[in-house]
Interface confidence: medium
């Protein structure tokens, strides 16, 4: 026997108060399958976090970072503080990279200098904190 | 006992007016998030317009923005839609019900009224 919830469209939820009716989603919320009971409530982009898609009725909101910020986790839980190129973030805000490490975004850590010796070769260029050593022949 | 009773509705011709209400006995509409949705003559159900968050936020399909307007007044416990320049798609039976946040993170309305036709018609 078919459930008669499986015909209720994405957008919509099975209403069990009224004889398994489909019933709309109220606002702020949405259903992206078919045959669901509830509808899900809508993810909110406030503070550090700006709307990047609107929910609707069938598709949850998506949100990104305000300028400064960068996104972290699936689908961006988390905004993370920018730095500048040549620093990481540190507990106590952005640093500057040690000498003989590098970070050429605006995120994520130093890194150290590529060591080109380990190649047999030598160093064409040298590393700053913002760019990693060039290595030649 | 928890109940919703729509009134208001009517005939009226293209362009005109209607107020419907919404008496709710058995709860406060003033601390619950409560709306309005239609069923059009062989169509399915559409929402038409709520307030959420204690009456902070209002709410309008796109189908009604600028024409209907949902208020309430807490002393008589009694939901209001005004419609303005109704048109011939704005025929169908209007509901008032509550939007019910569950514990699992579900939402859905209940407590329906019996409904309230509206027939926009020359």
């Known amino acids: 026997l078919q459930d008669p919830c499986s015909n209720c469209p994405a957008g919509t939820f099975c209403d069990n108060n009224r004889n398994q009716i489909c019933s709309p989603c109220p606002p702020n919320s949405f259903s992206s399958a078919g045959g669901q009971r509830t509808c899900d409530i809508c993810r909110q982009c406030k503070g550090v976090f700006r709307t990047r898609k609107e929910c609707s009725s069938t598709s949850n909101a998506e949100c990104d970072c305000t300028p400064g910020f960068h996104c972290l986790g699936a689908g961006c839980s988390m905004c993370e503080q920018d730095c500048k190129q040549g620093q990481e973030l540190t507990k106590k805000g952005c640093k500057d990279c040690c000498f003989g490490t590098f970070n050429d975004q605006k995120r994520g850590i130093c890194r150290p200098w590529t060591n080109c010796s380990l190649d047999g070769k030598s160093v064409l260029v040298n590393g700053t904190k913002e760019r990693d050593v060039v290595c030649g022949p | 006992e928890v109940q919703l009773l729509e009134s208001g509705g009517g005939l009226v011709q293209p362009g005109g007016s209607l107020r419907l209400s919404c008496a709710a006995s058995?709860?406060?509409?003033?601390?619950?998030?409560v709306g309005w949705v239609r069923q059009a003559p062989g169509k399915g159900l559409e929402w038409v317009s709520a307030?959420?968050?204690?009456?902070?936020?209002?709410y309008y399909a796109d189908s009604v923005k600028g024409r209907f307007t949902i208020s309430r007044d807490n002393s008589k416990n009694t939901l209001y839609l005004q419609m303005n320049s109704l048109r011939a798609e704005d025929t169908a039976v209007y509901y008032c019900?509550?939007?019910?946040?569950?514990?699992?993170?579900?939402?859905?309305?209940?407590?329906w009224g019996q409904g309230t036709l509206v027939t926009v018609s020359s």
């Open positions: 058995g709860f406060m509409l003033s601390a619950e998030d």
């Open positions: 307030i959420l968050d204690f009456g902070g936020s209002t």
């Open positions: 019900a509550r939007v019910v946040y569950h514990a699992g993170g579900g939402v859905t309305f209940d407590y």
